[in-house]
Amino acid sequence: MMTGTIETTGNISAEKGGSIILQCHLSSTTAQVTQVNWEQQDQLLAICNADLGWHISPSFKDRVAPGPGLGLTLQSLTVNDTGEYFCIYHTYPDGTYTGRIFLEVLESSVAEHGARFQIP
């Protein structure tokens, strides 16, 4: 019987060009975490395996960093990064727990103001 629950950072927003930390936490279970997958829609971003450690997918290695903890740091954000992110905890003996985070990447206020005013 799966008794655990996943707590996430929920719906979050960040500015274009900035960075954000995606965090999930598994609680209320004594199950052993064997691997955590981070996915964006259907794309694998990163894996943290209990034995093999971290692996960032090659297509994201320049913009994704492991941690803090089992979380994931996204850098140099673009508007295209807006969307759903999933932390998938593989545990023994419980099985799989999934948490969802929605990230909205906003145009920065600096960029907005910069577009409105011209330097004479």
């Epitope: 093999l52 450690g53 971290w54 692996h55 960032i56 090659p58």
Partner: nanobody, 127 residues
Framework: EVQLVESGGGLVQAGGSLRLSCAAS????????MGWFRQAPGKERELVAA????????YYADSVKGRFTISADNAKNTVYLQMNSLKPEDTAVYYC????????????????????WGQGTQVTVSS
Amino acid sequence: EVQLVESGGGLVQAGGSLRLSCAASGSTLSSYAMGWFRQAPGKERELVAAITGSGGRTYYADSVKGRFTISADNAKNTVYLQMNSLKPEDTAVYYCAANRRYSFPYWSFWYDDFDYWGQGTQVTVSS
């Protein structure tokens, strides 16, 4: 950039022991994850054992658990693989590899993340 040179391979009878050494130059190993891989003829290269530069984490393939021991001597900038109770199926070319893909305290023992490789040393176990 780190350069790796393996030594200690050879021919040994089943049940015997060998100690492989991997000497590094060009950088200090303490900031790397180090791995010993092996490749037998006609087979894919596989991770046998790995250790973080700090020595705080180790990994062993199921096939060598209890028989092989990986260790690091940061003062000598050398990683060792002590191989006991050798079996004919341990026959392969053994490679030392290093990576520092992610900063401390994060590490990777994933095959694709090892950036630096030695030339390999042959281990042959006869029955």
